[in-house]
Structures are given as structure tokens and as C-alpha cells.
Amino acid sequence: QPPPPPPDATCHQVRSFFQRLQPGLKWVPETPVPGSDLQVCLPKGPTCCSRKMEEKYQLTARLNMEQLLQSASMELKFLIIQNAAVFQEAFEIVVRHAKNYTNAMFKNNYPSLTPQAFEFVGEFFTDVSLYILGSDINVDDMVNELFDSLFPVIYTQLMNPGLPDSALDINECLRGARRDLKVFGNFPKLIMTQVSKSLQVTRIFLQALNLGIEVINTTDHLKFSKDCGRMLTRMWYCSYCQGLMMVKPCGGYCNVVMQGCMAGVVEIDKYWREYILSLEELVNGMYRIYDMENVLLGLFSTIHDSIQYVQKNAGKLTTTIGKLCAHSQQRQYRSAYYPEDLFIDKKVLKVAHVEHEETLSSRRRELIQKLKSFISFYSALPGYICSHSPVAENDTLCWNGQELVERYSQKAARNGMKNQFNLHELKMKGPEPVVSQIIDKLKHINQLLRTMSMPKGRVLDKNLDEEGFESGDCGDDEDECIGGSGDGMIKVKNQLRFLAELAYDLDVDDAPGNSQQATPKDNEISTFHNLGNVHSPLK
């Protein structure tokens, strides 16, 4: 049956409403018109809308939709942005502390090596930072470069301190001998395995968080198609053309329209769920040698062990190297690099009282739990938009896109829409190119995450056991094992608690005596935990 005639034969209500959208009344008919030029709000009788008004309604409808999407994703978007920043900063802090521990170990145990050692250690940890952030650096090369650089200094300063200046040209020969003679034993290989595994996982974790931001940003700024704009206009605004200002769209009708408009976005749902679950698997596996906090903060100890290994074999090595490098060409040895902020002031060693003992590991688990709140985010979007735009409760006395109905029927609405456009066709078009691109990126990261994920209960890799790890005693969730110094295994309670009770925030990068205590920001980053019973490099 035809709709009731506009209650206001002068289009007055329509004019006053439309003026809020578009100042000026030149587009609004003063009295109802046939509306034969209308393309969206097809009239069954006289109408208070013009073609220009329709265009404005379409624009407004699409803007409304974009705003609703943005408000839907606000919390999730900030959660990922905030955590990506927090973890990036936390990883940088771990790297800085690892560097400082290593420098402190050199200063306390091998003061004669410090000027050059500081330089090599600095370069190594700079590369570590760059690698985490995605640089195309080979971890094995980084470790090799560190030991290649260290050995000539160890040889000339520790093993052969009385070497005349004229003999300092054997640098290149010593670098070569370091690998050929395996002067550090298996320690470089051990470090390569630990560092590459932990950094790889860290890097993919950060990459995944950054992709999460990209996914949300993509759907957040989605531009809806013209067809969708027409559907939304018909749902939200066409009733106004008939003077039905207070009528709300039927809930069922809204759901149908949203399924059409959001079909592409909802296609992300499957890959989004997989993304969160794959990220969870990765995080579950980030312990022991897959946890960079654990590995990097224990490096000083392994490097110390490697130097002790060289010293133990000094006699044998000196003889062999003496023969091997005796005929090296005369070459000027470059002057040692002395950083200005070389010396560690004892005043820098401060006790930091941290309220919360919290590891990066616990932060990661917390993030995953929070992300799981949003696992159904994409499938929930159509419902969210309908529930945040005006819809009639119980689908009674509502607008079905064409007329006021007593009860919404999807079938009737579909029949009524046939001439106007095909909803099925809109769904069949497939997602927007940007959505397809982001789905491809999600598929790729999910694949990477799955490849990297470690079976939860797996003991350390077999090849690591062969390289000096004892893997007994490590099954318990509470006790995590890492490679130790001197007395074999170190057990660290609740993973590595990084700088709490006695937290030496030893920052060699800062001016002497000026400890830069990295303070937790807004309680959103507190990576300072206690070192448990890990041997501190600061004795």
C-alpha cells in the first residue's frame, strides 16, 4: 500500500532537518514534488527530496559509516599502537642494559681491553637493535664480527701483553686465526644460536604488532562504495523524503544492509582470528633461548666464559699463532677508539625500588589476553554499527527502505529492492583492493608466526645441548633455564626478572655519574625487574 502522505504538506520539517546537514535551502523543495530525477529514494508519490539532497544524504551516510567504524576500533587500535611502542622501547632498554652489563664485565674483569672492547660491544648491540627493527643484517655475521674484533685485542693485551709495537700488524692474521683455530671454542656458535633465535622471534613479534596497526588503520579509513552509499542513504535518510522524520529503520533491514556494505571487511575476520591465535602461540614459545630478555642479559656471562676459555688455552694458542702469524706483512695498527663516556662512575650504581616485578614475558601474556577480547571484532562490526545507529526495537513500525511497515520481512524488502539494485551482487563483488591487500599481509604474517611458533613444552634444541647446555631441571613453568657462567646452569625464577630489587641501571652511554634511570611511563612500561640469582656483572 502507498505510504501516508507527508504530514507536512510544505516540506517544512524536511527543510529544517536538511539545513542542519547543509546550510542554505536552495536544494529543498518548498512543497512535495514528483521526484522523477531521484535515483536512490525512489518515490511512490510526491517527495520532499531533490537529486542534490540525495547526493548530500549519500555523502553524509558514508561519512557516518566511516565515523562509526572509527569509533568501533578506537580501543583496539590504541591497544596495539600503545603496545607496539611499549615493546619496542622495552626491547631497546633490554639491549642497552645488555650492552652495559657486557661493558661492565670487561671493565671489572679485563680493564686492559676496555677501550677497544667498548667499541666492539657498542657496534654489536647497535646491530642487534637494528636487526630487531627490521634491518637486513645477518646475526651470524654480527657475532663473528664481535669475536673477530675482540680476539686481536685479547691476544695482544692479555695473552701477549709484552708484544712489541712492531708486532701489532698481525691484526688481520689474528682475525683469521680466530675462526680457523676455534680459539673461543663453541661459544661463538652458542651465542649465534641463542641470539639469532631470540632476535628472530622478537623481530617477528614487533612486525606482527605493526601489521595489526596497519590492519586496523586500513579498515578504519575504508572508503565505502557508491552502492553501499545508496543502501545506507535508503536506510537512514529516504524516510525523510516522505516527511517521516521520527521513523527508525528496521533492525533486520539494518543487518541486511550492513552485511552488504561490510562483506569485504568481514572477510578479514577469519585471518584476524588466526592472527591473534598465532601471535598467542608465538608468545607462548618466547622463553629460554627464544626470549631476548633472557638471552641478551645473559650474554655478558657467556662472553666472559669465552674469554676464560681462551685464557685456559693461552699457552697452546700462543705457540700456534706465533707460527701462523709470524710472517704477516708490516701494517700500521689503527689507533684505539676511546669513547668519551668510557668510565663507569660507582655513583651510577643505584638501587631501584620497583613496585611491580614484571617481566617482558608477563607483559606479552597480558597483551595477548587483552587482544583475545577483540578476536571477534570484525564479525561484530555489522552488529555494532546497527546498534550504534537508530534502529527500531523489535522490528515493529519501522522503515524498510521503501515504506513504513508494521513488521519487517526480509523477503518483502528484498523484492522491493530488486529494481533498485542487487544486494547479492554487491556482496559478490568481493572486497575492496585495500582489504584484499591487508588480507594477503595477514595471511603472510600468520604463516610466519606459525613457522616461528615453538611447541609449548619443548626442551631446548638438541644441538644446543651438544654445545654445553644442560637441559635437565627445566620442565617447570616457574623455573626457566639459561646458559650460565662458571658454575654451569643458572636458574632464573619466573623467567629473567630484569632489574628489580637490586637494579643496576648502569648506562655507559650517559655522562659519567649521571645515571639515566629509565622511568616507567604512565605505568605502561616497566621492564625493570630483579635479576634473580643471575650472576651480576657488577661485583
Epitope: A72, Q82, Q369, K372, S373, F374, S376, D522, E524
Partner: antibody, heavy 119, light 107 residues
């Protein structure tokens, strides 16, 4: 629409245990966290913990560790909370509440279950 | 744990009034704050999440805002059905914590 239907009131003796339930409908139960909240008579709200029915993952408020045990049965879309070694301090209304999928806030709440601990 | 403080435990206002209920966090919570309404019969509803987002079905006379660690819920044009106790809750850091509640009565 989303509904959380909680089990009826319980009168239990000190030292005993009680298990209360929360049946969910109108949404994918497995994919949303279920929270439990305590409210003592005339007092405010306290978060006990949450459970993710999809994989049984939990997180407890330290204050309720050892007191409350959360569980979920996906087949019946029902979440459970068991309270053990009950004392008069445990007399309260206990609510279940769903988190997600647009916020970590508690989007829908059950009507509450009154637990009275009395000799 | 993060302490959430609602300094006003009860307040009374007239129908049609504009009412503001405040809540303060002991440390930064990055806008992870919800407001809940508990009616006298005990039923609890989410009103606002993430500081200022209105939950579905909640009348637009409810709004939320923040200033640093201070958060507020505003009800414009108070109606009889708004008689209830209002709780804020942070979900930035585990364990999630609630404010003590503000009971709203009609004068």
C-alpha cells in the same frame, strides 16, 4: 540478543565449597572472556578473574587465587566458578560478565547469584 | 593494584538536572575506563567504555570524558530511571579494579 543466566541462590556452611554457573546465549561463547565479579552486601564491586572458554586461559585477581576456580564448558556455553573453604567474608552476590568484542569492558552482565555462608 | 576513587559516595539531584560523577585513578590508565550503572534491583549495565564511547542502547544523555587521571560521567537532563549507583572501572592493568560507587538519588 546476549543473555547471561546465572544459577540460583546458595546457602552453604563455613568450610564448604560452592559452584555457581552462568549460561550464555546470543553470542559465540568460546570467543569472549567471561569475568566474575564479587559484591558484598551494601559494598562495591571486585573483579575476581576471567576465563577464555575457547582454550581455558584464565587470569585471576591475586586476592582470589586459591579461593576461586574458574571453568567453562563450551558444549553447554556455561561458565562456572567454584569457591572453596568458604567463610562469612565470602557471603556476597557474584556476577558473571562478558568482555568484548569491541571493548575489554564488561558489555553484558548476569543477574547475579547470592551466596550466603552461614552455620 | 590501581586504586579507583569515587570521592562522592552519594549525591542527589532534581529531574532535568545535569549531573557529573567523577572518578580518579591512582596512576595512568590510558583511557581504559568503563562506567556501569547498577539499578536498585541489582542489575548491572555497561554505559560507557574506553572513557567516552557509548555502549549500544544507552541514551545519548550519558557521556564520558577525562582529564589526566581524572574521569567523569555526565548525565544531562536527569530522568527517573537514572536512579542507580554508578561505578567506574579501569581495565588498563591487571587486576581490573572498580571505584567505590556513587549513589544517585532524586531530590
Amino acid at each position: 540478543q546476549v543473555q547471561l543466566q546465572q544459577s540460583g541462590p546458595e546457602l552453604v556452611k563455613p568450610g564448604a565449597s560452592v559452584k555457581i554457573s552462568c549460561k550464555a546465549s546470543g553470542y559465540a561463547f568460546s570467543n569472549s572472556w567471561m569475568n566474575w565479579v564479587k559484591q558484598r552486601p551494601g559494598k562495591g564491586l571486585e573483579w575476581i578473574g576471567w576465563i577464555y572458554p575457547g582454550d581455558g586461559d584464565t587470569n585471576y585477581n591475586g586476592k582470589f587465587k586459591g579461593k576461586a576456580t574458574l571453568a567453562a564448558d563450551k558444549s553447554s556455553s556455561t561458565a562456572y566458578m567454584q569457591l572453596s573453604s568458604l567463610t562469612s567474608e565470602d557471603s556476597a552476590v557474584y556476577f558473571c560478565a562478558r568482555s568484548g568484542p569491541i571493548t575489554m569492558g564488561f558489555t553484558y552482565w548476569g543477574q547475579g547469584t547470592l551466596v550466603t555462608v552461614s552455620a | 593494584d590501581i586504586q579507583m576513587t569515587q570521592t562522592t559516595s552519594s549525591l542527589s539531584a532534581s529531574l532535568g538536572d545535569r549531573v557529573t560523577i567523577s572518578c580518579s585513578a591512582s596512576q595512568g590508565i590510558s583511557n581504559y575506563l568503563s562506567w556501569y550503572q547498577q539499578k536498585p534491583d541489582g542489575t548491572v549495565k555497561l554505559l560507557i567504555y574506553y572513557t567516552s564511547n557509548l555502549h549500544s542502547g544507552v541514551p545519548s544523555r550519558f557521556s564520558g570524558s577525562e582529564s589526566g587521571t581524572d574521569y567523569s560521567l555526565t548525565i544531562t537532563n536527569l530522568e527517573p530511571e537514572d536512579i542507580a549507583t554508578y561505578y567506574c572501572q579501569q581495565y588498563s592493568k591487571f587486576p581490573w579494579t572498580f571505584g567505590g560507587g556513587t549513589k544517585l538519588e532524586i531530590k
